[in-house]
Interface confidence: medium
Amino acid sequence: HPIPDSSPLLQFGGQVRQRYLYTDDAQQTEAHLEIREDGTVGGAADQSPESLLQLKALKPGVIQILGVKTSRFLCQRPDGALYGSLHFDPEACSFRELLLEDGYNVYQSEAHGLPLHLPGNKSPHRDPAPRGPARFLPLPGLPPALPEPPGILAPQPPDVGSSDPLSMVGPSQGRSPSYAS
């Protein structure tokens, strides 16, 4: 048996786990949370390179979630919408990890308190959290073979040369998508 994620040793700063976050909630098709290269977040029926995640404790009970293949952080807008960002914004990209007795975990935005859900069939800006918190089962992935890439947490300068028609370049959050029409 691997050390369960409920181990108190895993709740303190610097602890790194590689996991697939699997959900089998009744209202959801069975899926693994996946952070794609272009910043979209979705669910994959099977484990995929994009669904292998690195969970790193920032402080007790609070983690950041990084897509191992895509080097994008899982982040959440105030309306509950999920996206993958090349930049780590502590407010948007920190999640409180709540451990359930059955081995499942619940994640919620530390800043907004909104529960983490895979994108459903409704646009998140209209229906950000229609259900209770989604339960995720952290399935073991490969142990990290290499240290984190240097500077992964260092914010990159915003893309000032881009006149992005989607207004996706934020002043302090890197490229987070704008859902406001």
Partner: antibody
Framework: QVQLQQSGAELARPGASVKLSCKAS????????ISWVKQRTGQGLEWIGE????????YYNEKFKGKATLTADKSSSTAYMELRSLTSEDSAVYFC??????????WGQGTTLTVSS | QIVLTQSPALMSASPGERVTMTCSAG?????MYWYQQKPRSSPKPWIY???NLASGVPARFSGSGSGTSYSLTISSMEAEDAATYYC?????????FGGGTKVEIK
């Protein structure tokens, strides 16, 4: 401003290969994906595949595996698509497009490929 | 792969008329994206994340839907809106486009 400048029209023989280019400017090339989209005359749009220059990771539509190969040169901010074993079915306009958050937000002007003997 | 079916394939509308076209997905998708294309031109980004207008798109356009049913509406048709509109999804690989709805002006 963001621009995707594609190479000029190509005329090729059946069985030959051709390499189309897409030069990006006005944004950080490695922060976005470049997709390629096919459009035959009077037809709809078909996604071929996508490359992420930052990682060189590529994703293909199964239909085009073995037909198309996507590459990118970070130093020149240019994406390439090589099409091999050309047939008349490959005659089309090919667009490169920038990919961001699931959306194709900028498009090149298109390259017309004609395959004829 | 997820098949997107657009209807109607061709429609004609008078100036000022309300126009609605639909995009039906073979299985549920999270979001829909729309593009406008005119003859001999590249497609233009039109609507993203189901209901958000891309930069420069007139407010008379709107998008809605969820699950397997999505639509694009022009509240008051204008001559410049004559074009072909394509829907696109990426909830599942490969990314797929609908066959397009061609809108003509009467």
């Amino acid at each position: 401003q963001v621009q995707l400048q594609q190479s000029g029209a190509e005329l090729a023989r059946p069985g030959a290969s051709v390499k189309l280019s897409c030069k990006a400017s006005g944004y950080t090339f490695t922060n976005y994906g470049i997709s390629w989209v096919k459009q035959r005359t009077g037809q709809g749009l078909e996604w071929i595949g996508e490359i992420y220059p930052r990682s060189d990771n590529t994703y293909y539509n199964e239909k085009f595996k073995g037909k198309a190969t996507l590459t990118a040169d970070k130093s020149s901010s240019t994406a390439y698509m090589e099409l091999r074993s050309l047939t008349s079915e490959d005659s089309a306009v090919y667009f490169c497009t920038r990919s961001d958050y699931g959306f194709f937000d900028y498009w090149g002007q298109g390259t017309t490929l004609t395959v004829s003997s | 792969q997820i098949v997107l079916t657009q209807s109607p394939a061709l429609m004609s509308a008078s100036p000022g008329e309300r126009v609605t076209m639909t995009c039906s997905a073979g299985s549920s998708v999270s979001y829909m994206y729309w593009y406008q294309q005119k003859p001999r031109s590249s497609p233009k980004p039109w609507i993203y994340l189901t209901s958000n207008l891309a930069s420069g798109v007139p407010a008379r356009f709107s998008g809605s839907g969820s699950g397997t049913s999505y639509s694009l509406t022009i509240s008051s048709m204008e001559a410049e809106d004559a074009a072909t509109y394509y829907c696109q999804q990426w909830s599942s690989n490969p990314r797929t486009f609908g066959g397009g709805t061609k809108v003509e002006i009467k």
